[in-house]
Interface confidence: medium
């Protein structure tokens, strides 16, 4: 939270995570001010000379923008008057991680707040029945992760069981030489059971569930960002 009091306004940020190679958002809100021309938004990054982004007098001012952010930043211009100073960041890179400051000045006062931005790669897992194996097995695949995650299996029937002895996990480096494809195979699965493949690093946790019965296969996946 930012500072508040006389001539200061409350600025709020949220720790967030960016997915390498995709577009991300650094969240920042402030006390609204209907006078758009009086609002100044500055985004700064610790260790970087120059600005990440500046918005003032109702438009972007990129004259002091640092080269590494050129052509990669945008505010939600139509939402500035309602107190949204969030920054869109295009083509998130590992090097974008760090501490950012959202600085706001309006006719009501000024304020700022810091934001910790984490970067990595995370993706939804997909579980399929592997009919090619000698015994029935499940194959859990997720295309993009970084840093290298841990993978664990669980089952509804055998709650608390350790599946490390009957599973095999591999990590294959993707073509851009940063992110990796995660593949985990669980052997000797039984029918009429729900299995979960859980992939987790310090940025995100993803779970893929599969329920295999005689008549059908049901799947569900979910992804949650950690510390957000």
């Amino acid at each position: 939270f930012g500072i508040s009091g006389k001539h200061f306004i409350t600025v709020t940020t949220f720790t967030s995570a960016g997915n390498i190679g995709e577009d991300g958002t650094l969240s920042c809100t402030f006390e609204p001010d209907i006078k758009l021309n009086g609002i100044v938004i500055q985004w700064l990054k610790e260790g970087i000379k120059g600005l990440v982004h500046e918005f003032k007098e109702g438009k972007d001012d990129l004259s002091q923008q640092h080269e590494m952010f050129r052509g990669r930043t945008a505010v939600f211009a139509d939402q500035v008057v309602v107190g949204n100073a969030s920054l869109r960041l295009k083509n998130v890179q590992l090097t974008d991680a760090g501490t950012y400051t959202c600085y706001i000045r309006t006719s009501k006062g000024k304020g700022n707040a810091n934001l910790e931005y984490k970067t990595g790669a995370f993706s939804m897992p997909e579980i399929n029945v592997d009919y090619n194996a000698s015994s029935e097995s499940l194959r859990c695949e997720a295309p993009r992760w970084f840093p290298q995650p841990t993978v664990a299996w669980a089952s509804q029937v055998d709650q608390g069981a350790n599946f490390s002895e009957v599973s095999n996990t591999s990590f294959e480096l993707n073509s851009e030489n940063v992110t990796m494809k995660v593949v985990s195979v669980l052997y000797n699965v039984t029918i009429n059971n729900t299995y979960s493949c859980m992939i987790e690093n310090d940025i995100a946790k993803a779970t893929g569930d599969i329920k295999v019965t005689d008549s059908e296969v049901k799947r569900r996946s979910q992804l949650q960002l950690l510390n957000s």
């Epitope: 982004h53 050129r70 052509g71 295009k90 073509s175």
Partner: antibody, heavy 122, light 107 residues
């Protein structure tokens, strides 16, 4: 309807500076990105750089030390200067307009000039 | 710089054919891809931006798809006016780079 027209010398001597101007007619230069792209004979397209109407620029790193792009909003023009040219700079030079989300012409280039051929030769 | 690879480099087709051109990026570019058409002696013309958004005035037989590193331009029914060279271009990070081009010629 917005139209772009490149102008400048068609022949430049090696080691000299290539100077081109793009005139925007039928619309304003304000609030758009304005780029220069070139195409050597029989080859593909190469970005040189772009400028926003406010004056902020981005240049292709392979040409950055030799390139300057400037804008004159009062004349509805923007210009390209490429110094220390060699025969490898012989190409058709296009100016183009772009718009986008991320303070860059990342929604493509929707209006182009017809191109001007520049030959570098002594 | 991000490398863009187009295939095929030349494509022979007939009027009415469904034509597909592929563009691959050397790293993920999300959906930041544009497609252009160029005819000999003319400037390129924007067809598609943001991978799948059709530029105003472009016939609906042109469509774009893909995200990440693999993209396609499809012409659902090739018309006489469509014989040209097609370029993809990543808009993800500067310098924006073009593919080598795909020439669509009459079979």
């Amino acid at each position: 309807q917005v139209q772009l027209q490149e102008s400048g010398p068609g022949l430049v001597k090696p080691s000299e500076t290539l100077s081109l101007t793009c005139t925007v007619s039928g619309g304003s230069i304000i609030s758009y990105y304005w780029g220069w792209i070139r195409q050597p004979p029989g080859k593909g397209l190469e970005w040189i750089g772009y400028i926003y109407s406010s004056g902020s620029t981005s240049y292709n790193p392979s040409l950055k030390s030799r390139v300057t792009i400037s804008v004159d909003t009062s004349k509805n023009q923007f210009s390209l200067k490429l110094s220390s040219v060699t025969a490898a700079d012989t190409a058709v030079y296009y100016c183009a307009r772009g718009s986008g989300l991320y303070a860059a012409p990342d929604y493509g280039l929707d209006v182009w000039g017809q191109g001007t051929t520049v030959t570098v030769s002594s | 710089d991000i490398q863009m690879t187009q295939s095929p480099s030349t494509l022979s087709a007939s009027v009415g054919d469904r034509v597909t051109i592929t563009c691959r990026a050397s790293q993920s570019i999300s959906s930041w891809l544009a497609w252009y058409q160029q005819k000999p002696g003319k400037a390129p013309k924007l067809l598609i931006y943001k991978a799948s958004s059709l530029e105003s005035g472009v016939p609906s037989r042109f469509s774009g798809s893909g995200s990440g590193t693999e993209f396609t331009l499809t012409i659902s029914s090739l018309q006489p006016d469509d014989f040209a060279t097609y370029y993809c271009q990543q808009d993800n990070s500067f310098p924006f780079t073009f593919g080598g081009g795909t020439k669509v010629e009459i079979k």
